[in-house]
């Protein structure tokens, strides 16, 4: 056959769906690869063709759209499973073509099993709630387009394995779950089960997400440098190792880039002809506040190095701070017999 623009296997969209549930999968061509939508393509006389490769097979085969109860169907640019089966797992390809044009992309679809407590290998989206911040909501995700607005589904919410009813500060409100005042104890996996009728059958959609309670912007402060500080003096003799930790606390801030860096005499350490290494470690609190430590180390410090200015800098969306380390050359202790004795007139 003639050449086709092949976008390859789009592993960025690793689609996971639960077994025995409906799934609607849009052809990624129109969302991520082509500059026009399905209706434009359709009205220009292009046809959308679907096929697939089963898991652990190399053979591409057409999708069987003649299964009982139209289990698999296509509607515009959407491939429908009503419902999925475990052996639907594989790589699916959608191809847009006519006699002069062809473009295609493949994507992996994994049908996943869940247990009675909704545990599964499914990768879960994370929703962050601010601690003690007032009412916040999460919404049952990815249920649009499964049923018309005239259909009123029933929605049941679970935390872990437990149905949410009469919880202190968590209230189910249809597609939304409201947290009156989020606390660390609200961390966990939350599942909504959406049940709706279609053509005399009942379908369930299960959606699980992880709630993580994080520091509130109300409590956020600029970075705090705990070390270096005014109480510690790094007193070294030439030839010794100089180790200066820079320890910085960052409040949790959504989408903030936290950075820590050292300057030596106002310059980037790399820019200076000095054998310096910097090692970084990062730890997080339960509310995702961050502590970064960068240890500056000079294996064999020279007297010249001990005169330099060592400054730790830190920056977040809340501001930039800097602190200089107090570095000095150790004065050698006098040798009593020679120096002090001479002072007392000894000969």
């Amino acid at each position: 056959s003639e050449r086709c623009d092949d976008w390859g296997l789009d592993t960025m969209r690793q689609i996971q769906v639960f077994e025995d549930e409906p799934a609607r999968i849009k052809c990624p061509l129109f969302e991520h690869f082509l500059k026009f939508n399905y209706s434009t393509a359709h009205s220009a006389g292009l046809t959308l063709i679907w096929y697939w490769t089963r898991q652990d097979r190399d053979l591409e085969e057409p999708i069987n759209f003649r299964l009982p109860e139209n289990r698999i169907s296509k509607e515009k640019d959407v491939l429908w499973f009503r419902p999925t089966l475990l052996n639907d797992t594989g790589n699916y390809t959608c191809m847009l073509r006519n006699t002069t044009y062809c473009s295609k992309v493949a994507f992996p679809l994994e049908v996943v099993q869940k247990d009675s407590c909704f545990n599964s290998p499914m990768k879960l989206p994370v929703h962050k709630l601010y601690i003690e911040y007032g009412i916040q909501r999460i919404t049952c995700p990815n249920v649009d387009g499964y049923f018309p607005s005239s259909v009123k589904p029933t929605i049941t919410w679970y935390m872990g394995c437990y149905k949410i009813q009469n919880f202190n500060n968590v209230i189910p409100e249809g597609m939304n779950l409201s947290f009156l005042i989020a606390l660390i104890s609200n961390n966990g996996n939350y599942t909504c089960v959406v049940t709706y009728p279609e053509n005399g059958r009942t379908f369930h959609l299960t959606r699980t997400l992880t709630v993580k309670v994080v520091g509130s912007p109300k409590n956020a402060v600029p970075p705090v440098i705990h070390s270096p500080n005014d109480h510690v003096v790094y007193e070294k003799e030439p030839g010794e190792e100089l180790l200066i930790p820079c320890t910085v606390y960052f409040s949790f801030l959504m989408d903030s880039r936290n950075e820590v860096w050292w300057t030596i005499d106002g310059k980037k350490p790399d820019d200076i002809t000095i054998d310096v290494t910097i090692n970084e470690s990062i730890s997080h609190s339960r509310t995702e506040d961050e502590t970064r430590t960068q240890i500056l180390s000079i294996k064999k410090v020279t007297s010249e190095d001990l005169k330099r200015s060592y400054v730790c800098h830190a920056r977040s969306a809340k501001g930039e701070v800097a602190k200089a380390a107090k570095v000095k050359q150790k004065v050698p202790a006098p040798r009593y017999t020679v120096e002090l004795a001479c002072g007392f007139g000894a000969t």
Epitope: D265, K268, T273, S309, A322
Partner: antibody
Framework: QVHLQQSGPELVRPGTSVKISCEAS????????INWVKQRPGQGLEWIGQ????????YYNEMFKDKARFTVDKSSSTAYMQFSSLTSEDTAVYFC?????????????????WGQGTSVTVSS | DIQMTQSPASLSASVGETVTITCRTS??????LAWYQQKQGKSPQLLVH???TLAEGVPSRFSGSGSGTQFSLKINSLKPEDFGSYYC?????????FGAGTKLELK
């Protein structure tokens, strides 16, 4: 606001030396480099070198390392450049300019504030 | 030392025109390049640092671009106060070098 005030014009004899001052105000003097830049009449800019007041660290352009010497007086937030063995080639306007410190976000050491320049004329 | 090649050496343009000055470096300097403007008898003024970051108070008709070894300064719709000399400078490491300059004159 940041201000760099340079000393006045100098008329000097060949073979002698000259010391130009640059008084800084409006920022923390110790934490920024003071750079020195030469501009001969009708010519471009030449970087002479820099000094870091907090530690007296210096870097010199190879072409000037035997000619220029930088010092600072921390108490008065003033930087000095001494130019020695003067010849007619040293007739120029000399600028001091502030740079750095390095920032993860703003990169390296652009010269963000400049003094008004000191004119040095070497003539017998 | 890093060599800076700035072009053109001089340039004539009219008010309202758009001009571009380029600067090439002898080795990769990432984005550590600054542009300065200098008017006759005055001190230079920082326009752009880190290749594309406008300095405080610089009008948005100025823009810097490039990285590695190729850089440019673009001035959109020239104003009378834009005429003068322009210099590039790498601000990297422990030795800073200026380009030879571009004199922008009124046509």
């Amino acid at each position: 606001q940041v201000h760099l005030q340079q000393s006045g014009p100098e008329l000097v004899r060949p073979g002698t030396s000259v010391k130009i001052s640059c008084e800084a105000s409006g920022y923390i003097f110790l934490t920024y480099w003071i750079n020195w830049v030469k501009q001969r009449p009708g010519q471009g800019l030449e970087w002479i070198g820099q000094i870091f007041p907090a530690s007296d660290s210096t870097y010199y352009n190879e072409m000037f390392k035997d000619k220029a010497r930088f010092t600072v007086d921390k108490s008065s937030s003033t930087a000095y450049m001494q130019f020695s063995s003067l010849t007619s080639e040293d007739t120029a306007v000399y600028f001091c300019a502030r740079s750095g410190p390095y920032s993860y976000y703003a990169g390296g050491y652009a010269l963000d504030y400049w003094g008004q320049g000191t004119s040095v004329t070497v003539s017998s | 030392d890093i060599q800076m090649t700035q072009s053109p050496a001089s340039l004539s343009a009219s008010v309202g025109e758009t001009v571009t000055i380029t600067c090439r470096t002898s080795e990769n300097i990432n984005s550590y390049l600054a542009w300065y403007q200098q008017k006759q008898g005055k001190s230079p003024q920082l326009l752009v640092h880190y290749a594309k970051t406008l300095a405080e108070g610089v009008p948005s008709r100025f823009s810097g671009s490039g990285s590695g070894t190729q850089f440019s300064l673009k001035i959109n719709s020239l104003k009378p106060e834009d005429f003068g000399s322009y210099y590039c400078q790498h601000h990297y490491g422990t030795s800073l070098t200026f380009g030879a300059g571009t004199k922008l004159e009124l046509k």
